[in-house]
Interface confidence: medium
């Protein structure tokens, strides 16, 4: 179980690196973030560490109310602050593992 979670964490972070470069990856992460109401791996600040992502931006799928461009110049109050690894991991533990 712990190994699966560790792999999921590493994979999620790897996909974040590819987010700005790969539309397919972006759509998968966007779907995860929107469906699970989460943002980033540990939390939304993870997006700051992606070199090709603008410093003032998170994906629009992080927004509580998703609209085009809502992730630009984001306010913490308007985005999901929980990380996806913990949130999706909890769901996996409950329903799959």
């Amino acid at each position: 179980r712990d190994k699966v979670m560790s792999e999921f964490n590493n994979n999620f972070r790897q996909q974040m690196e590819n987010y700005p470069k790969n539309n397919h990856t972006a759509s998968i992460l966007d779907r995860m973030q929107a469906d699970f109401k989460c943002c980033g791996a540990a939390n939304y600040t993870d997006w700051e560490k992606i070199p090709s992502m603008s410093k003032n931006r998170v994906p629009d799928s992080c927004c509580i109310n998703v609209t085009v461009g809502c992730g630009i110049n984001f306010n913490e109050k308007a985005i999901h602050k929980e990380g996806c690894v913990e949130k999706i991991g909890g769901w996996l533990r409950k329903n799959v593992l």
Epitope: T45, E48, S54, K55, N56, G69, C70, I72, N73, F74, N75, E76, K77, A78
Partner: antibody, heavy 119, light 108 residues
Framework: QVQLVESGGGLVKPGGSLRLSCAVS????????MNWIRQAPGKGLEWVSY????????YYADSVKGRFTISRDNAKNSLYLQMNGLRADDTAVYYC????????????WGQGTLVTVSS | DIQMTQSPSSLSASVGDRVTITCRAS??????LNWYQQKPGKAPRLLIY???NLQSGVPSRFSGGGSGTDFTLTISSLQPADFATYYC??????????FGQGTRLEIN
Amino acid sequence: QVQLVESGGGLVKPGGSLRLSCAVSGFTYTDYFMNWIRQAPGKGLEWVSYISNSGAIKYYADSVKGRFTISRDNAKNSLYLQMNGLRADDTAVYYCVRDPRSYYGFDYWGQGTLVTVSS
Amino acid sequence: DIQMTQSPSSLSASVGDRVTITCRASQSISNFLNWYQQKPGKAPRLLIYGASNLQSGVPSRFSGGGSGTDFTLTISSLQPADFATYYCQQSFSNPPVTFGQGTRLEIN
């Protein structure tokens, strides 16, 4: 009504330190990012630093990076700017500014506090 | 960093005149452009946000336009209270936000 009141400015020698404070009232402080913006005498406006609602995110202008530190105390509705290694070109009026983010602009500014760096 | 260039840097006009100030960004900033008015010894005041939205309490003689790289601030009929310095500011790349150098509007 919304109020932002800066304090802590004054005359300091080059290499010295100063801590600016900004007391805010009239709005839910934790709903907003906050900024420091400065204006040298007779010059234009220069963004200095911002801090996010919770304090998790902080950014600085290249001109002050490594010398200035922004912080906030949400329990006290206060914003701070610790300025170390002050130089003559840091002389300016420093404004505490509310930032709604997105494309809304800086909607409320304090009256400013003057920092003079001179020997 | 995104550079903001205002023109003209100073402008003389008379009460009742229509005045336009322009602001150009070094790259596209969509509509993330704001305008401020500053009077001597006072803090700047937000006039227009998002390129064309009038801030609450600002007279309707002020209007903003443009998107991408080119923007304008127009005062339809100058009033004595309008003589001041005007700044544009982009918040698309934030940090750092950047301001134009200012346009000083003087009485002719």
